[in-house]
């Protein structure tokens, strides 16, 4: 009874129907169910479409511009369970722009375990409001139902018998009302009694066993289900998996030899995006978690003694890094067996981007060349880098390799890192603005002082546009408020004073004292520092009354952590010699000051004598907050309460809005309107900043989620057929 | 045939304690939701206590809620309910019942707290 | 939480007649109602579940009603074993009894 058909993976139906019969035989799709951009589509052409087999949805189920689809009740009458594993933008059940759809009609839809629901822009689109969404899911607040032809009030949603005076359908209360559920004209919403939990229940109330999710056929009965709240097995839904059966896409229970040919099928495969599985927590899962590698005799996942190696084997020995894409490519390796060749010249974000691609590198087996990359400023991206072999050494016998790089300033910060180079040479030509100093500092770091011959670091052609700094300026005063730091610093003049341009002085937001100088900069434009020019302070003859430069800065947040460095500004001298120097990063906070407000207060009367209020933290604590206080006062009772006549027609009962407590957007627009019509003369408030502000708030998150379908949906045509449940895009 | 024996009753100071246990024999026992039931004295019937046939799932009412505890032994086919901090106004005759519409019933076993 | 008011409390009935008790629930219950038949040192016996279900192996003689929230039981031909007192449970939202009806036979 249980599943009883196929399992299928997850599918992306597009463009026509050809495709939808694939979902023929499934009763479980385990991946995501996506059926979209349909545009020729007609009402007819669904009539006979039906797959009754279908219980449950493991990831999601979205529907996007399919044309001529008015209801799903036919096309799916026995979905039960959308589980949510993964999620499309944290909805489990996406209904966008279906222009003809009337009714969802999912009557058997009995629970959404993971994630929420959206249901906009669908103009078409009733039976909405008589659907108790807190019966099938719990985040009901996080649902997003707008823009929908149930929210003008112009549905007139009739549920199974009310045409003839009875009501045929469970109620559930919304805003103290009863309201009937249904999800058609002739389907009532199953309502369990609440002791039933999530588990389901008959027809009659009496409930499935706890192993069950969503319904049963029969009561207490573990093989009885329709779906399986934990894990199916052998036609039994089952809590755990037992020995010698694996936990597999958190639904089902597989043997050892399922989860092995999965291995085996991925290995023999060309496909990319493809997984391993292996074994790891009585689990069979894609990959092993951080931390641990696998043991391929038996698929099982074991501790990794320190950082887990994954060697990356280099195609014909070695590899061009030359965008983010290709530095995605090595993604988590640990050894590279070959050599690395980097050669960017541009791009977005690179420093970040590299080091989350290039960061977990330990050990190169070859030689690394840095070659043209105008668009690096420091190598600080490798940032476990500890060992260059050189087993392959460049032309001349080099492990590591810089040749002209127009704005590499750094090679690593070497107070915090190591480096060995097993053999080979080091070679440094053409890189304008790397200080000499950085590199005889790698030559003693890393063990390859007296290997280079005369030629192989140019001294004329390294350095020879930078400001080596080679003293330290030391910071003289330091004060604080809430949004200002103030900073003095001991004065520097270079031997010829007009080569002093002035000081720069680089800030940023710091959580945690590990900054370095050349952390997230690029040559590109990308810098997480702050920059402030300071002219140079007025030059005394008098070394002792010399003026102490120094800056106020200003527009900061209250108890911030702030890293921040100064150095100087000096002028290219010609005898290729530049004098300069520079502060050490120190680490400032600024002071307390008032939070701002609480957000989002709720009050509700929960008694004649009672009122429960609550509130989110502020968004800017602006210190530590220790407590709140709450004040309160009498109100004079509105004489308008008593006076009114509570039998006059037109008065509406309240009606339910989507995410309470707020009132959505539409809502607040119908009531104004409503109160207009009445009184004639009356025009409605201005917003308050407080509404303007929800309403922007609104429109960003309305933009951000059509973006990130757009992206998702919309991709480029493949030359093969068919994407698999192992499909790795939304998440 | 399904058969639900109570016992564990008694004769309690306020503020004491007793454990009721419920043999059950006749059906899958592990399969099952079960529950206590009480009738007081003046002839009224209170739910007391639901536990899920896993054990997974509690609920009470807010009268006997942190009071009272119901749990179960799925290998030896018994419920068991902890009374603690007892009051007069918890002398009654407890029932276990079945599932979740209590469509069987013990014989009771008659708890009297008093001074 | 959800109150049960049963009518009558007791009432008295003379053998092949017919009896109705009535349970009204504080708020809709969706037909998720029980009728029990409680003798004295017995347990209670569940006779119709879902308004109008009757539980396997009893007679036709007894039935059930109603819907939001009135509910009616009825014993037709009454007979001498049918002395008992009759609860309504809900179990739309726990479980809630509904305070007895003593039937006797005249």
């Known amino acids: 009874h249980l599943y009883p058909g196929e399992v299928c993976p997850g599918m992306d139906i597009r463009n026509n129907l050809t495709r939808l019969h694939e979902l023929e035989n499934c009763s479980v799709i385990e991946g995501h169910l996506q059926i979209l951009l349909m545009f020729k589509t007609r009402p007819e052409d669904f009539r006979d479409l039906s797959f009754p087999k279908l219980i449950m949805i493991t990831d999601y189920l979205l529907l996007f511009r399919v044309y001529g689809l008015e209801s799903l009740k036919d096309l799916f009458p026995n979905l039960t369970v959308i589980r949510g594993s993964r999620l499309f933008f944290n909805y489990a059940l996406v209904i966008f722009e279906m222009v003809h759809l009337k009714e969802l009609g999912l009557y058997n839809l009995m629970n959404i375990t993971r994630g929420s629901v959206r249901i906009e822009k669908n103009n078409e689109l009733c039976y909405l409001a008589t659907i108790d969404w807190s019966r099938i899911l719990d985040s009901v607040e996080d649902n997003y139902i707008v823009l929908n032809k149930d929210d003008n009030e112009e549905c007139g949603d009739i549920c199974p018998g009310t045409a003839k005076g009875k009501t045929n359908c469970p109620a559930t209360v919304i805003n103290g009302q009863f309201v009937e559920r249904c999800w058609t004209h002739s389907h009532c919403q199953k309502v369990c009694p609440t002791i039933c939990k999530s588990h389901g229940c008959t027809a009659e109330g009496l409930c499935c066993h706890s192993e069950c999710l969503g319904n049963c056929s029969q009561p207490d009965d573990p093989t009885k289900c329709v779906a399986c709240r934990n894990f199916y097995l052998d036609g039994r839904c089952v809590e755990t998996c037992p020995p010698p059966y694996y936990h597999f896409q958190d639904w089902r229970c597989v043997n050892f030899s399922f989860c092995q040919d999965l291995h085996h099928k991925c290995k023999n495969s060309r496909r990319q995006g493809c997984h391993q599985y292996v074994i790891h927590n009585n689990k069979c899962i894609p990959e092993c978690p951080s931390g641990y590698t696998m043991n391929s005799s038996n698929l099982l996942c074991t501790p990794c003694l320190g950082p887990c190696p994954k060697v990356c084997h280099l195609l014909e020995g070695e590899k061009t890094i030359d965008s983010v894409t290709s530095a995605q490519e090595l993604r988590g390796c640990t050894v590279i067996n070959g050599s690395l060749i980097i050669n960017i010249r541009g791009g977005n974000n690179l420093a970040a981007e590299l080091e989350a691609n290039l960061g977990l590198i330990e050990e190169i087996s070859g030689y690394l060349k840095i070659r043209r990359s105008y668009a690096l400023v420091s190598l600080s991206f490798f940032r476990k880098l500890r060992l260059i072999r050189g087993e392959t050494l460049e032309i001349g016998n080099y492990s590591f390799y810089a040749l002209d790089n127009q704005n590499l300033r750094q090679l690593w910060d070497w107070s915090k890192h190591n480096l060995t180079i097993t053999q080979g040479k080091l070679f440094f030509h053409y890189n304008p603005k790397l200080c000499l100093s950085e590199i005889h500092k790698m030559e003693e770091v890393s063990g390859t002082k007296g290997r280079q011959e005369r030629n192989d670091i140019a001294l004329k052609t390294n350095g020879d546009q930078a400001s080596c700094e080679n003293e330290l300026l030391k910071f003289s005063y330091i004060r604080t408020s809430f949004d200002k730091i103030l900073l003095r610093w001991e004065p520097y003049w270079p031997p010829d004073f007009r080569d002093l341009l002035g000081f720069m002085l680089f800030y940023k937001e710091a959580p945690y004292q590990n900054v370095t100088e050349f952390d997230g900069q690029d040559a590109c434009g990308s810098n997480s520092w702050t920059v402030v020019d300071i002219d140079p302070p007025l030059r005394s003859n008098d070394p002792k009354s010399q003026n102490h430069p120094g800056w106020l800065m200003r527009g900061l947040k209250p108890w911030t952590q702030y890293a921040i460095f100064v150095k100087t500004l000096v002028t290219f001298s010609d005898e290729r010699r530049t004098y300069g120097a520079k502060s050490d990063i120190i680490y400032v906070q600024t002071d307390a000051t008032n939070p701002s407000v609480p957000l989002d207060p709720i009050s509700v009367s929960n008694s004649s004598s009672q009122i429960i209020l609550k509130w989110k933290p502020p968004s800017d604590p602006n210190g530590n907050i220790t407590h709140y206080l709450v004040f309160w006062e009498r109100q004079a009772e509105d004489s308008e309460l008593f006076e009114l006549d509570y039998c006059l027609k037109g008065l509406k009962l309240p009606s339910r809005t989507w995410s309470p407590p707020f009132e959505s957007e539409d809502s607040q627009k119908h009531n104004q309107s409503e109160y207009e019509d009445s009184a004639g003369e009356c025009c409605s408030c201005p917003k308050t900043d407080s509404q303007i502000l929800k309403e922007l708030e609104e429109s960003s998150f309305r933009k951000t989620f059509e973006d990130y379908l757009h992206n998702v949906v919309f991709v480029p045509r493949k030359t093969s057929s068919g994407t698999g449940a192992e499909d790795p895009r939304p998440s | 045939e399904v058969q639900l024996v109570e016992s564990g009753g008694g004769l309690v100071k306020p503020g004491g304690s007793l454990k009721l246990s419920c043999a059950a024999s006749?059906?899958?026992?592990?399969?099952?939701?079960m529950s206590w039931v009480r009738q007081t004295p003046e002839k009224r019937l209170e739910w007391v206590a639901t536990?899920?046939?896993?054990?997974?799932?509690?609920d009470y009412p807010d009268n006997v809620k942190g009071r009272f505890t119901i749990s179960r032994d799925n290998a030896k086919n018994n419920l068991y309910l902890q009374m603690s901090h007892l009051r007069s106004e918890d002398s009654a005759m407890y029932y276990c019942?079945?599932?979740?519409?209590?469509?069987?019933w013990g014989q009771g076993t008659l708890v009297t707290v008093s001074a | 939480d959800i109150q049960m008011t049963q009518s009558p409390s007791s009432l008295s009935a003379s053998l092949g007649g017919k009896v109705t008790i009535t349970c009204k629930a504080s708020q809709h219950i969706n037909k998720y109602i029980a009728w029990y038949q409680h003798k004295p040192g017995k347990g209670p016996r569940l006779l119709i579940h879902y308004t109008s279900t009757l539980q396997p192996g009893i007679p036709s003689r007894f039935s059930g009603s109603g819907s939001g929230r009135d509910y009616s039981f009825s014993i037709s031909n009454l007979e001498p074993e049918d002395i008992a007192t009759y609860y309504c449970l809900q179990y739309d939202n726990l479980y809630t009894f509904g305070g007895g009806t003593k039937l006797e036979i005249k």
């Open positions: 006749g059906f899958t026992f592990s399969n099952y939701a």
């Open positions: 019942a079945r599932a979740t519409n209590f469509a069987y």
């Open positions: 536990i899920s046939d896993g054990g997974h799932y509690i």
